[in-house]
Amino acid sequence: TGGQGPMPRVKYHAGDGHRALSFFQQKGLRDFDTLLLSDDGNTLYVGAREAVLALNIQNPGIPRLKNMIPWPASERKKTECAFKKKSNETQCFNFIRVLVSYNATHLYACGTFAFSPACTFIELQDSLLLPILIDKVMDGKGQSPFDPVHKHTAVLVDGMLYSGTMNNFLGSEPILMRTLGSQPVLKTDIFLRWLHADASFVAAIPSTQVVYFFFEETASEFDFFEELYISRVAQVCKNDVGGEKLLQKKWTTFLKAQLLCAQPGQLPFNIIRHAVLLPADSPSVSRIYAVFTSQWQVGGTRSSAVCAFSLTDIERVFKGKYKELNKETSRWTTYRGSEVSPRPGSCSMGPSSDKALTFMKDHFLMDEHVVGTPLLVKSGVEYTRLAVESARGLDGSSHVVMYLGTSTGSLHKAVVPQDSSAYLVEEIQLSPDSEPVRNLQLAPAQGAVFAGFSGGIWRVPRANCSVYESCVDCVLARDPHCAWDPESRLCSLLSGSTKPWKQDMERGNPEWVCTRGPMARSPRRQSPPQLIKEVLTVPNSILELPCPHLSALASYHWSHGRAKISEASATVYNGSLLLLPQDGVGGLYQCVATENGYSYPVVSYWVDSQDQPLALDPELAGVPRERVQVPLTRVGGGASMAAQRSYWPH
């Protein structure tokens, strides 16, 4: 993978027709930031600027607008927002920040409401949104941020909303809060300094007994020469009811620990950007996948990492030792005193004593950190969001597939082989303006990922199998969603009955998978061409033989007959071979790719001259042929002839 990290095998530029994509936009609407999939998977609810939308995503192609309800910030709040020196152009609007399914008939939504957070229930009727009634709009402080640029997170668990956001206009008072439902409203205590003033929340993930919050904040427990940011996981118990005298209406089970995502001997990736849970059959083996960047730009470029954390490891750290603050030295050290009962954060049902609560107020930071497994480290890219799913290969093996949104508007599809580093199947540039990916939502039933941007929503089918036109290319792609169907001779999406199909997720080796009959027993190091393109030379013209670079992971060379053309003697320009008609120029030219130890012809040309036709090599007798015209340039100037066929670069 080199110092850059894995390269995407295939790259699609914005507007490249070879990657099936569709884009939803709506005149006058912007900031498609919040995405929610309906329980049946057929409707995508979208929180945009001053509106909530319901999109029908049942059919392939552009999502269809079912209906849209406006929810603008009121004139009163817009006026106040402008008075408070905020921008009427960019800030004094209602940016929808929370959108959750409350029950079968209602969504719950919150927005910034021109720096005056507000929430409301939205009634559903046959998955259509009913208009918002102004007398049903409630205070949303602690549920939505004031400022649209502030990070936030929220998750609905058992009818209660757990949210992490900024709780004041200035953006200096972070809060973790539980609202809705029958349990008492609970908050973190600002005065106890459980959270640093700059805490920035990126995810909330429920587990069996607790809810985990993922965030970054300035570290207080290290002596460092510059302000050091640190990533954290915090837990609160679902059954927490707050204290009776001490910690009234406050969490009594709040604990936090450091998350570590680093390669051995390297500076850590210390800024968490997003995290998701990939559930497993057994909760103990479930893992959390998180995207990190670093506050240090190595070599002047941003880099990103994806780390996996096991729930078991997180639980173990929260059951371990605490740190405590030495008031004299203002240093955090390991607490070595006696245990209190019930132990803070243990989710025991009984009422906690004043002694236990007093202890809890000061012992909320865990001594150990949760160490993640780095699965993907990539420089020159800043990942902003991720979505993760498990895909079953042809052999029944399970593969983790990650979809990673970047700060420049592209989507990376990464595959994590079992107990190994990730590789990148493809990179798709979605935004022509390099706008960042705001959100990602997997829609498994639709086989697609939806990516929210400032200007609209991209629907990205999870795989693009049909672009791999040969068995070799299909197998080398190592996309768990794709396999080669020898019958139809197509690379297709895996479906139910795929017995004779070809795929090699483990090695990605076409040598064993794609050869049939006697060749299977004695594999050849290079496969024969599938098609020969016949080209006629034109006197006094330079022929240009294009070679489409189908894979960024392959190395390419040209051969003439059975001999490799040396780099020194050939004129290769942008991958194309340039030929001057002269004696001995005719015959078979092949652009050969070598990838994963396997060589295969990407394109084969038979060059013939009008005055001296050549007999085709008998070994190639069975290979289909096609007469083509290639670009040519007259020697001594003149126009270049247009090719009949265009060759697309990846």
């Epitope: 009121s74 004139e75 009163r76 006026t79 709009v137 205070d139």
Partner: antibody, heavy 121, light 109 residues
Framework: QVQLQQPGAELVMPGASVKMSCKAS????????MHWVKQRPGQGLEWIGA????????SYNQKFKGKATLTVDESSSTAYMQLSSLTSEDSAVYYC??????????????WGQGTSVTVSS | QAVVTQESALTTSPGETVTLTCRSS?????????ANWVQEKPDHLFTGLIG???NRAPGVPARFSGSLIGDKAALTITGAQTEDEAIYFC?????????FGGGTKLTVL
């Protein structure tokens, strides 16, 4: 129930300052703006200004800028108005009034009983 | 500065419907003026009745309603009662400040 308690009267010298209080109870103080209104004997009501109790942002009637300063103390759920450089023109009853108008409109529902300020040497 | 004008006095009988109005010197009153109606009873007892043109304050009897009639804001008391005898002030919002009217003295005879 909601109550806004104001001291009954203040007697102050011309040129001096006075700081009057408005203690709120029966609701979450920081959820509502607080308005201040002046009533001179035999005259109508004049709006002085208002304060957003959650972030101490203030909005003043141009006429009272420099004269009135609005503040809050969240811990005691109390709003304050300080009047400076007092003259006989400032002799009046001063009311605090809660704004219950939520997100969509302004509305003053609960009023204090007023503080009568007399400026006299 | 805008001037807000109200009837100086009105008289009604118990059970009758009476409408008090509020005019702005700058033109028609609109919902953006968030018309407020406040009742003053003896001993400086002020109570907010209506906010934002037509929103009744919590605990205010349903006989009080606010609206826009023509180019003015209006307070209507449907079935006036003797305890409604008071001075009623209207206040209008002008994008960054409030202006109160002079008040209407309502007598219920």
């Amino acid at each position: 129930q909601v109550q806004l308690q104001q001291p009954g009267a203040e007697l102050v010298m011309p040129g001096a300052s006075v700081k009057m209080s408005c203690k709120a109870s029966g609701y979450t103080f920081t959820d509502y703006w607080m308005h201040w209104v002046k009533q001179r004997p035999g005259q109508g009501l004049e709006w002085i200004g208002a304060i957003d109790t959650s972030d101490s942002y203030t909005s003043y009637n141009q006429k009272f800028k420099g004269k009135a300063t609005l503040t809050v103390d969240e811990s005691s759920s109390t709003a304050y108005m300080q009047l400076s450089s007092l003259t006989s023109e400032d002799s009046a009853v001063y009311y605090c009034a809660r704004d219950y108008g939520n997100f969509y409109y302004y509305a003053m529902d609960y009023w204090g009983q007023g503080t009568s300020v007399t400026v006299s040497s | 500065q805008a001037v807000v004008t109200q009837e100086s006095a009105l008289t009604t009988s118990p059970g009758e419907t009476v409408t008090l109005t509020c005019r702005s010197s700058t033109g028609a009153v609109t919902t953006s003026n968030y018309a407020n109606w406040v009742q003053e009873k003896p001993d400086h007892l002020f109570t907010g009745l209506i906010g934002g043109t037509n929103n009744r304050a919590p605990g205010v009897p349903a006989r009080f309603s606010g609206s826009l009639i023509g180019d003015k804001a209006a307070l209507t008391i449907t079935g006036a009662q003797t305890e409604d005898e008071a001075i009623y002030f209207c206040a209008l919002w002008y994008s960054n400040h409030w202006v109160f009217g002079g008040g209407t003295k309502l007598t219920v005879l």
